[in-house]
């Protein structure tokens, strides 16, 4: 006869491990007992359990409550056992020793491999600001057995670097993602992808990038100077900028206080019916936690009387 077993049995932490041992004997042969032992190198054999054809399952005190026979129906030639709730310390070599009548003893070894799935964590780097050089955007760490694979999934251009730390029964892998911050990266996802044989599917942790910036400020509303004449209603100046965090706006007049009746509404400066008093230099001040910008414009309110007079003069001069 001969023993049938597996070279390697692989289970995920917490699962039950079936340790197979089947005696394929000649007709008339019987299995008297099957002894299971842990036989790691450098240590003596430690009995795990013994299946006795007459007296049933015997379990070592060290494994009490954790070793069982597979559920019925059972073949009397099958010496397989179940090791419940596998832990990392169970990983190692096991020996199945079968005593048969009348053929004698047979033995076989297998290796139990216990996969420890990783629990990845993602840590964002320091605050990202436009204008910085190569900066750490995020790091991702996963520890497991065997060592997990850590990669990045993103549309953002950057560089990665990985390092691994081996522990007695596992390995921790840390991958860092570096980039040169730019405003176009704002809101872009950066996803850490962890692969491991103990996982049914890759684990993914997504971090949304936030890059602080403040665009140059400009003022709109003076495109047609001829519209800025005495008596005109609804005249307004609008300050244009963008930033992260969103900026706040402040309006001042360089050559004095804002004229009465002028309304400040965030990025917009609204004028009452225009008078020559509204002529002057206006400054839009844009700021956020990252930076501040100024833009100034000169408003020159035209007097139609003067304009028509000039035109008359010009006509008469011709």
């Amino acid at each position: 006869g001969e023993l049938e077993t597996s070279d390697v049995v692989t289970v995920v932490l917490g699962q039950d491990a079936k340790l197979p041992c089947f005696y394929r004997g000649d007709s008339g042969e019987q299995v008297g007992q099957v002894a299971w032992a842990r036989v790691d190198a450098g240590e003596g054999a430690q009995e795990l359990a013994l299946l006795h054809s007459k007296y049933g399952l015997h379990v070592s005190p060290a494994y009490e409550g954790r070793v069982e026979q597979p559920p019925p129906p059972r073949n009397p030639l099958d010496g397989s056992v179940l090791l419940r709730n596998a832990v990392q310390a169970d990983e190692g070599e096991y020996e199945c020793r079968v005593s048969t009548f009348p053929a004698g003893s047979f033995q076989a070894r297998l290796r139990l491999r216990v996969l420890v799935p990783p629990l990845p964590s993602l840590n964002p780097g320091p605050a990202l600001e436009e204008g910085q050089g190569l900066t750490l955007a995020a790091s991702c760490t996963a520890e497991g057995s065997p060592a997990p694979s850590v990669t990045w999934d993103t549309e953002v251009k950057g560089t990665t670097s990985s390092r691994s730390f081996k522990h007695s029964r596992s390995a921790a892998v840390t991958s860092e993602f570096h980039l040169v911050p730019s405003r176009s990266m704002n809101g872009q996802p950066l996803t850490c992808v962890v692969s491991h044989p103990g996982l049914l599917q890759d684990q993914r942790i997504t971090h949304i990038l936030h890059v602080s910036f403040l665009a140059e400020a400009s003022v709109r509303g003076l495109e047609d100077q001829n519209l800025w004449h005495i008596g005109r209603e609804g005249a307004m100046l609008k300050c244009l900028s963008e930033g992260q965090p969103p900026p706040s706006y402040n309006w001042t007049r360089l050559d004095g206080p804002l004229p009465s009746g002028v309304r400040v509404d965030g990025d917009t400066l609204g004028f009452p019916p225009l008078t020559t008093e509204h002529s002057g230099i206006y400054v839009c001040h844009v700021s956020n936690e990252f930076s501040s910008r100024d833009s100034q414009v000169t408003v020159d309110v035209l007097d139609p009387q003067e304009d028509s007079g000039k035109q008359v003069d010009l006509v008469s001069a011709s």
Partner: nanobody, 119 residues
């Protein structure tokens, strides 16, 4: 042939303890199983506990947590530590040595030692 000699029985009050010993001699194999059975008056003989040479054990549900079986392979001796004894544990306790024989197992029995638990 295998010879077995038990000792340690006696009279004890409920809640007390006793330790039984059984020494085996003769042609003991390297794969033998040793253990204890008991038989109360007018009842069938029942398994109490058995132990392998490697120290793996099997207990009857009625004694789990109260009785502990152990063995000294060098002396071919098996022990049964009985704690929290109850009147229903009263019986003759027999040592058994299970040896391979031909196409199966052969049980060798001792003469037995009496355990009486009074209430």
């Amino acid at each position: 042939e295998v010879q077995l000699v038990e000792s340690g029985g006696g009279l004890v009050q409920a809640g007390g303890s006793l330790r039984l010993s059984c020494a085996a001699s003769g042609s003991i194999s390297s794969i033998n199983l040793m253990g204890w059975h008991r038989q109360a008056p007018g009842k069938q003989r029942e398994l109490v506990a058995t132990i392998t040479r490697g120290g793996s054990t099997n207990y009857a549900d009625s004694v789990k947590g109260r009785f502990t079986i152990s063995r000294d392979n060098g002396k071919n001796t098996v022990y049964l530590q009985m704690n929290s004894l109850k009147p229903e544990d009263t019986a003759a306790y027999y040592c058994v040595d299970v040896e391979p024989s031909g196409m199966g197992w052969r049980d060798y029995w001792g003469q037995g030692t009496q355990v009486t638990v009074s209430s």
